[in-house]
């Protein structure tokens, strides 16, 4: 971007460079040949997060509990409120305007990554040697029981949804 007639943190209006208002303040009146730009602080429920020439501050975001939201970080005159989701819920979109329950991983799938306030559960299919027999938002795939270590033999093979079934070894006469 080529340099413009006005410096950083200034704006061009009616052939003069006026100072922008600092974050947390709004424009009341432009500068003139004889006066500086007039700015006023945003009220308690409002903010502006950049050097600006806005005549109105932005309203802080409302974290609506009816949509499963709660305040993660309270807004200031320079920052917006940050909302997050209640326990067991995550944001529907990047803007986090509402929340949805975490997805559960079905039998045959385990949790690869547990959900957070902003991301859903990530599931993965249980590989050979592992199983999950529950629908869960927390359980990983579990390894099949090792019959050998119990001095038992496999009586029924395991699947991605079931554990192996162990039984006693056939005794040789």
């Amino acid at each position: 971007e080529p340099p413009t007639a006005c410096r950083e943190k200034q704006y061009l209006i009616n052939s003069q460079c006026c100072s922008l208002c600092q974050p947390g303040q709004k424009l009341v009146s432009d500068c003139t040949e004889f006066t500086e730009t007039e700015c006023l602080p945003c009220s308690e429920s409002e903010f502006l997060d950049t050097w600006n020439r806005e005549t109105r501050c932005h309203q802080h975001k409302y974290c609506d509990p009816n949509l499963g939201l709660r305040v993660q970080q309270k807004g200031t005159s320079e920052t917006d409120t940050i909302c997050t989701c209640e326990e067991g819920l995550h944001c529907m979109s990047e803007s986090c305007e509402s929340c949805v329950p975490h997805r559960s991983c079905l039998p045959g799938f385990g949790v690869k990554q547990i959900a957070t306030g902003v991301s859903d559960t990530i599931c993965e299919p249980c590989p050979v040697g592992f199983f999950s027999n529950v629908s869960s938002a927390f359980e990983k795939c579990r390894p099949w029981t090792s019959c050998e270590t119990k001095d038992l033999v496999v009586q029924q093979a395991g699947t991605n949804k079931t554990d192996v079934v162990c039984g006693p070894q056939d005794r040789q006469r």
Epitope: P3, T4, A5, N14, S15, Q16, C17
Partner: antibody
Framework: QVQLVQSGAEVKKPGSSVKVSCKAS????????IEWVRQAPGQGLEWMGV????????NYNEKIKDRVTLTADKSTSTAYMELSSLRSEDTAVYYC?????????WGQGTLVTVSS | DIQLTQSPSSLSASVGDRVTITCRAS??????LNWYQQKPGKTIKLLLN???RLHSGVPSRFSGSGSGTDFTFTISSLQPEDIATYYC?????????FGGGTKVEIK
């Protein structure tokens, strides 16, 4: 008192360049923008560009930005407007003006005639 | 670009008459409107800035009003020395633009 004194009339060939000067006095040169405006014979006023003599930063009219260059020399309180690749339609009176809430003071104008 | 439509393009009035010129902007320009006077062979003069503020040294018979898109320039009592072309100009958004001008003559 504020004064802007421009260089004299020029006759130029198509394809050549012209450089018009504007010497300011009576105020702090770096504190005000310098605007450039032109007026073709019998026509209205057309804004060309603006320069901040303090920083050297400038803005140009998109229609002519590829052909115009604005500069300022703080040591002599003089602003310059150079227009290249001249064509017959560039025949006009060229004005510099001081900014500060509109074009507050104007130079007397410089007639540039482009003719083969 | 913001267009400024000035009317009338010319007018003829008697000395002492009240003269009114209008300037309409193609979009809201708040009060960033200036009025200039151009006399043949003389430097262009700023008469009013910010729609209604009289520039220093300008006689009080010149006045201006308006905000947004519609503006008015008035000479309360036309004098022989007021024979000139008058231009409005917006300072809201680059590129700065001018109205087409109004030529004022004495009847």
């Amino acid at each position: 008192q504020v004064q802007l004194v421009q260089s004299g009339a020029e006759v130029k060939k198509p394809g050549s360049s012209v450089k018009v000067s504007c010497k300011a006095s009576g105020y702090a040169f770096s504190d005000y923008l310098i605007e450039w405006v032109r007026q073709a014979p019998g026509q209205g006023l057309e804004w060309m560009g603006v320069i901040n003599p303090g920083s050297g930063g400038s803005n140009y009219n998109e229609k002519i930005k590829d052909r115009v260059t604005l500069t300022a020399d703080k040591s002599t309180s003089t602003a310059y407007m150079e227009l290249s690749s001249l064509r017959s339609e560039d025949t006009a009176v060229y004005y510099c003006a001081r900014g500060g809430g509109g074009f507050t003071y104007w130079g007397q104008g410089t007639l540039v005639t482009v003719s083969s | 670009d913001i267009q400024l439509t000035q009317s009338p393009s010319s007018l003829s009035a008697s000395v002492g008459d009240r003269v009114t010129i209008t300037c309409r902007a193609s979009q809201d320009i708040s009060n960033y409107l200036n009025w200039y006077q151009q006399k043949p062979g003389k430097t262009i003069k700023l008469l009013l800035n910010f729609a209604s503020r009289l520039h220093s040294g300008v006689p009080s018979r010149f006045s201006g009003s308006g905000s947004g898109t519609d503006f008015t320039f008035t000479i309360s009592s036309l004098q022989p020395e007021d024979i000139a072309t008058y231009y409005c100009q917006q300072g809201s958004t680059l590129p700065w633009t001018f109205g087409g001008g109004t030529k004022v003559e004495i009847k």
